[in-house]
Structure formats: C-alpha cells, structure tokens
C-alpha cells in the first residue's frame, strides 16, 4: 500500500520503523568495539537534499548482503522487512533512482581491527559495526523524507 504520504507515513511507522528499532535494539552492545574509521559506503552514499531516494535505494540493496549473516530468524526477518519495505516505499514516493544492478560484495572495512582477534572475529564485528551504522542512517534518512512530506 502506497500510503506513506497520505497517512503521515503510517507504513513507515508501523512496519519499517518497528523493524529498524528492533534491529538496533538487538545491536545495543555493538558500538563501543567499533573503530572510528569511516566506511567507504558512507563516504560515497549520503542522505543529502534531493538525494534521499538514491541513498535509500543503495542502502536497501546493501542490507540484503547481511541476510543469513546472523543466526536468529527474527533478525533476518526484520532485515528483509527493512530492505524490501524501503524499496517498495521508495517506488511509492517516486524517490527511487536506481542504477545498473551490482554484484553484491561484502561491506569493506577501511582499516583492519586490532590484531589480537582472529580475522573471522574481526570481520564479523566489522560487518556488525557497518550494519548498525547503515540502519541508523536509513532511519535518519526516512525521517528526513517524512519531515519533508509533512511540510509540503
């Protein structure tokens, strides 16, 4: 249902926001162990004025890389809801501006984590740091769009 504007963002608030908040809540412990280094994705893809749809389109695509990364089914379900829901709502709002499909790689760190952890642990932590930031940015960007639709 394309009622993101007509009902003050009810689709976002009742589906996407709930899933984003559930995911972020389950990742509360992640953050203190994350390095300060900026991920390449966030250097290149920013939720700037008139580019919100472009950012969210790529962010949703990036989210799909994290499906099955986590062991719990609930986590995957919420990821899927956010990824698919974002893509659907972008089409509703006319915000989407896609590009050629990409071969999905994994989130790349800009620097390696402390050397005393195994590479596998490093990578998993790094991926979770990236995922948490991605979800936070998606939430912020949707809120920016909704503020705009309520103002006009």
């Amino acid at each position: 249902d394309c009622d993101i504007e007509g009902k003050d963002g009810k689709q976002y608030e009742s589906v996407l926001m709930v899933s984003i908040d559930q995911l972020l809540d389950s990742m509360k412990e992640i953050g203190s162990n994350c390095l300060n280094n900026e991920f390449n994705f966030f250097k290149r893809h920013i939720c700037d004025a008139n580019k919100e749809g472009m950012f969210l389109f790529r962010a949703a695509r990036k989210l799909r890389q994290f499906l099955k990364m986590n062991s719990t089914g609930d986590f995957d379900l919420h990821l899927l809801k956010v990824s698919e829901g974002t893509t659907i709502l972008l089409n509703c709002t006319g915000q989407v501006k896609g590009r050629k499909p990409a071969a999905l790689g994994e989130a790349q760190p800009t620097k390696s984590l402390e050397e005393n952890k195994s590479l596998k642990e490093q990578k998993k932590l790094n991926d979770l740091c990236f995922l948490k930031r991605l979800l936070q940015e998606i939430k912020t960007c949707w809120n920016k769009i909704l503020m705009g639709t309520k103002e006009h």
Partner: antibody, heavy 117, light 111 residues
C-alpha cells in the same frame, strides 16, 4: 544556504607553518565529511585531505607528513595545519563539503597561500 | 594512484554547438554498480562548481543541457547546446580510490 569561508592565507616564508580555517554555515556541520583541495596558479586541482563525521581522516600520501586536517564541530570550523611549507605549496586552498559519490558538492571561495622568501 | 586523462586539453566552439569532453581513468572506477566519476565547471577566479556526480547524475540547479555518461574507465561530459555562460574549464574527478584525483582540465573557449 550552504556557505564555506576560508581564511588564514597569506605570504609565508619557506619552512614556516600556517593554519587555514574554513567557517561553515547553512547545514548541520557535524553530519558531513569535509575536504581540502588546492590549485596552484594556472594549474589543475589537487585533493589534500578529508575528515569524516566521526573524526577519522584520509590524506593524499604526498602531504600526510606535513599537513594535518581537523575539525571543531562546536565552532562549525574546519582546519588545515600546514608545516614545512615550500615554494611549490603556493596555491589557492579550498575547503569543500562532501557530496554524493564523494564529490565536492559545495566549495568555499578559496584562500591564497604564497610561499616565498 | 588512479590517473585521470582528459581530452582535449582545450577546444574552441560556438554558441549552440554540441561539445563533448572525455575522461579516461588508468583503472576502473566502478564499484558495486556505480561509477565514481564527478564533473566540475570552473570559471576564472572562482571555485569549481559540481555539475555531474556518480557519472550521470545531474546536480540540483545545473541546466539539463549538461549530461554525463560512461562506465569502467571511459567517461564523457556532453553539453548539448553550448551557451555563452558555459565557456569555462571542466574537470573530471574519480572517487573510487584514495587519493581522490582530478583530470588535467579542458578549457572551452569561444571560436
């Protein structure tokens, strides 16, 4: 509207230091990456460094030993500390706000640094 | 470092002409479905101005006569019908890899 205003340029002797400032307004300063780019007289553009929202930095390797980028979010100001200046550092120095695709979406008017004895 | 080679370095054209500027990267600037090339216009004594980002996206407020295309290593900036205010120097820039690098510029002059 987005505004970036550089200051701190001028004539300096070789081997000396200089700190450039870039005062920003019209956007949420702490939410954006920022860059320094320079242009020697009659020449092309050269990227120097970037600083990201969390404070991490990227440098052009040619300048990492002499130049330091920093930001003060409470003052909405970006800085470039330049040490051991050489004649070839003579240029107009621009600050720029990061844009989509790591482009330079907004630029200051530039500040001229002349290194001469 | 990724080298960006622009051609021609200068060109003369008349108002109304279609102008094409090319930019060649020393290696691919594509990643995850996007081409990380941006185009700028610079007039004498002024700061550069962003025209095109991520190869083909027109920056807000830039006239539709400007367009960008290409992928991999070969990119093009096209001005469909040159206007008097378009006489300037144009630069391409890659952002796929640090250090961010620019082409040498293309000066568009009046014929």
């Amino acid at each position: 509207q987005v505004q970036l205003v550089e200051s701190g340029g001028g004539v300096v002797q070789p081997g000396r230091s200089l700190r450039l400032s870039c005062a920003a307004s019209g956007f949420t300063f702490s939410s954006y990456g920022l860059h320094w780019v320079r242009q020697a007289p009659g020449k092309g553009l050269e990227w120097l460094a970037a600083i990201w929202t969390g404070g991490s930095t990227d440098y052009n390797a040619a300048f990492i030993s002499r130049f330091t980028i920093s930001r003060d979010n409470s003052k909405n100001t970006l800085y470039l500390q330049m040490n051991s200046l050489r004649a070839e550092d003579t240029a107009v120095y621009y600050c720029a706000r990061n844009g989509y695709g790591e482009s330079f979406a907004y630029w200051g008017q530039g500040t001229l640094v002349t290194v001469s004895s | 470092d990724i080298q960006m080679t622009q051609s021609p370095s200068s060109l003369s054209a008349s108002v109304g002409d279609r102008v094409t500027i090319t930019c060649k990267a020393s290696q691919s600037v594509d990643d995850d479905g996007d081409s990380f090339i941006n185009w700028y216009q610079q007039k004498p004594g002024k700061a550069p101005k962003l025209l095109i980002y991520v190869a083909s996206n027109l920056e807000s407020g830039v006239p539709a006569r400007f367009s960008g295309s290409g992928s991999g290593t070969d990119f093009t900036l096209t001005i469909s019908s040159l206007q008097p205010e378009d006489f300037a120097t144009y630069y391409c820039q890659q952002s796929n890899e640090d250090p961010l690098t620019f082409g040498g510029g293309t000066k568009v002059e009046i014929k």
